[in-house]
Interface confidence: low
């Protein structure tokens, strides 16, 4: 399927609107510090060039690869060296190294100001004045803050963003209509970004075999009626889509994702009975719907797995003939029978099964050796079951904020070298697992909880890789993708850690504390809690609770005072002294 002009091919396949949107996302994800206007100019130039190639595929430069065209365009940015430093060195390289170089300089934690939401009337005026620019600005701002955001999905978010403004800017109460929709988009967007980041980390750090294994397990749970060959085909196609998006090939990725959606909708009968309502929707919505589709019902008469994978005398023969296919079939068969298991647990079981066959197929009596392999799965299954049970009980007992605090203390004691903002962000997100998963029925709790935790812990791994400070974190993050969560769960108090010297400045608060939103107040208090644990890692729960209760009381008292600043100045040092005494 070769084309004289790749850029013309993608422009024609995607259409001008999606083409421009995807190029803007690609550029914004690579050059995260560039001003909006600069990116719009580059996108317009690329689009005009693409149109000349559509008109005449033999025109000059139309035969160049997309990486060459986009890279050349990015390297025309005048301030590259001043703004990005050594990233400018990428421009001295040839493709494909230049693109690899740009990819390596993507920043998961760019130094960008948090997005401030203007007044509703201001936003509606901007939307009506220039809708196209308003929506481009949205793509740009999200893409530069989330350099691995799944680009075709970001187009779907932008479409929903547009729909929200179109509807709510005409409503009687604009704010009541718009703000909940924007909050929902923000929260869903952050979750989508984090999920995609795990997919890219899986591909980039552990290879496509790891991603394919994840996809086999997940798709087998979703489509338990589909044949193994059908699941394998979907896995191959899905791997291609995500490899492209994670590699910055956003036009190819969006095009291939559309092809995959088309294929799934044309072959619903052999995939799942749940696809019908997705397939009636327009493209962006259809692809999103297919990705989020609920699990189909399990076939009623699935035989026991033991016959083919334990009792059969041909296990070692089948394994030796085609290891990956045999293990893939095992994973498929196990996953379609267990929608109640997390994907990560299923992958651990497949890994344990593989290890047993590696050992036993070389033994004198292989069958005798692997006869009890399913018994070995029991502790692997019980570990996440118990973890979910204990943490949901704790969540129900404490509520979200205090549950987050318990996790903050737990994780700061495990890895106190990690920066305080990272510990706060990650622990707050770990704590959200309670509200997200604990209300679900038993059969859905573990897949919800453990697979969500994998996404959150990947964020810790990604941030830590940028600035490595803890060997324990590096070990848990790099040794095994499927065992990351158990690895972190197993970490104990770091005995080698030298407690941080007490710094009164860290615990000095001002009247501006009183004007913060509830969420911002929580973050301030949780930041103080992490610093306390770093100062006194062996402090008991009771000691820390006492200090935090005093802190809350001190803040509440000063925020009610007439002269708030004076109160903070006077009461602050007393609180610090009392806290030090309590923790001595």
């Amino acid at each position: 399927d070769t084309h004289k002009s790749e850029v013309a091919h993608r422009f024609k396949d995607l259409g001008e609107e999606h083409f421009k949107g995807l190029v803007l996302v690609a550029f914004s994800q690579y050059l995260q510090q560039c001003p909006f206007e600069e990116h719009v100019k580059l996108v317009n130039e690329v689009t005009e060039f693409a149109k000349t190639c559509v008109a005449d595929e033999s025109a000059e430069n139309c035969d160049k690869s997309l990486h060459t065209l986009f890279g050349d365009k990015l390297c025309t940015v005048a301030t590259l060296r001043e703004t990005y430093g050594e990233m400018a060195d990428c421009c001295a390289k040839q493709e494909p190294e230049r693109n690899e170089c740009f990819l390596q300089h993507k920043d998961d934690n760019p130094n960008l100001p948090p997005l401030v939401r203007p007044e509703v009337d201001v936003m509606c005026t901007a939307f009506h004045d220039n809708e196209a620019t308003f929506l481009k600005k949205y793509l740009y701002e999200v893409a530069r803050r989330h350099p691995y955001f799944y680009a075709p999905e970001l187009l779907f978010f932008a479409a929903r963003y547009k729909a929200a403004f179109a509807e709510c800017c005409q409503a009687a109460d604009k704010a009541a209509c718009l703000l909940p929709k924007l909050d929902e988009l923000r929260d869903e967007g952050k979750a989508s970004s984090a999920k995609q980041r795990l997919k890219c980390a899986s591909l980039q750090k552990f290879g496509d075999r790891a991603f394919k294994a994840w996809a086999v397990a997940r798709l087998s749970q979703k489509f338990p009626k589909a044949e193994f060959a059908e699941v394998s085909k979907l896995v191959t196609d899905l791997t291609k889509v995500h490899t492209e998006c994670c590699h910055g090939d956003l036009l190819e990725c969006a095009d291939d994702r559309a092809d995959l959606a088309k294929y799934m909708c044309e072959n619903q009968d052999s995939i799942s009975s749940k696809l019908k309502e997705c397939c009636d929707k327009p493209l962006l919505e259809k692809s999103h719907c297919l990705a989020e589709v609920e699990n189909d019902e399990m076939p009623a008469d699935l035989p026991s797995l033991a016959a083919d994978y334990v009792e059969s005398k041909d296990v070692c023969k089948n394994y030796a003939e085609a290891k990956d296919v045999f293990l893939g079939m095992f994973l498929y068969e196990y996953a379609r029978r267990h929608p109640d298991y997390s994907v990560m647990l299923l992958l651990r079981l497949a890994k344990a099964y593989e290890a047993t066959l590696e050992k036993c197929c070389a033994a004198a009596d292989p069958h005798e050796c692997y006869a009890k392999v399913f018994d070995e799965f029991q502790p692997l299954v019980e570990e996440p079951q118990n973890l979910v049970k204990q943490n949901c009980e704790l969540f129900e007992q404490l509520g979200e904020y205090k549950f987050q605090n318990a996790l903050l203390v737990r994780y700061t004691k495990k890895v106190p070298q990690v920066s305080t903002p990272t510990l706060v962000e990650v622990s707050r997100n770990l704590g959200k697992v309670g509200a997200k998963c604990c209300k679900l029925p038993e059969a859905k709790r573990m897949p919800c909880a453990e697979d969500y935790l994998s996404v959150v812990l990947n964020r810790l791994c990604v941030l830590h890789e940028k600035t490595p400070v803890s060997e324990k974190v590096t070990k848990c993050c790099t040794e095994s993708l499927v065992n990351r969560r158990p690895c972190f769960s197993a970490l104990e108090l770091d005995e080698a850690y030298v407690p941080k010297a007490f710094n009164a400045e860290t615990f000095t608060f001002h009247a501006d504390m009183c004007t913060l939103s509830e969420k911002e107040k929580q973050v301030k208090k949780q930041t103080a809690l992490v610093e306390l644990v770093k100062h006194k890692p062996k402090a008991t729960k009771e000691q820390l609770k006492g200090v935090m209760d005093n802190f809350a009381a001190f803040v509440e008292k000063c925020c009610k005072a007439d002269d708030k600043e004076a109160c903070f100045a006077e009461e602050g040092p007393k609180f610090v002294a009392a806290s030090q005494a309590a923790l001595a």
């Epitope: 390596q104 980039q204 552990f206 496509d208 040794e479």
Partner: nanobody, 115 residues
């Protein structure tokens, strides 16, 4: 403990060939994409070639395309780089790395191309 040990470097005349090996241990080699990276004296590390976990997908820097071949033997946990038609500008310390990283976590093997 992750360990990568390169071997096979040496002094060779322009136009000559060498085969580098990288023996891996301490991790599931067959699950990872691997790369070769080189560093010439006084220069930064330069990515040379990459191969996916199964060995099907290989990528090369323009400067070595058509001359170098990357391969792997997952059973032996070994990565290879066959270098033909070597040029003086290929002179560098060669390192194998996990994934597409250009950060060096090993000792490397010296390749010198000179007449």
């Amino acid at each position: 403990e992750v360990q990568l040990v390169e071997s096979g470097g040496g002094l060779v005349q322009p136009g000559g060939s060498l085969r580098l090996s990288c023996a891996a241990s301490g991790f599931t080699f067959g699950s990872f994409g691997m790369s070769w990276v080189r560093q010439a004296p006084g220069k930064g590390p330069e990515w040379v070639s990459a191969i996916d976990s199964g060995g099907a997908d290989t990528r090369y820097a323009e400067s070595v395309k058509g001359r170098f071949t990357i391969s792997r033997d997952n059973a032996k946990k070994t990565l290879y780089l066959q270098m033909n038609n070597l040029k003086p500008e290929d002179t560098a310390m060669y390192y194998c790395t996990i994934g597409r990283s250009t950060s060096r976590g090993s000792q490397g093997t010296q390749v010198t191309v000179s007449s």
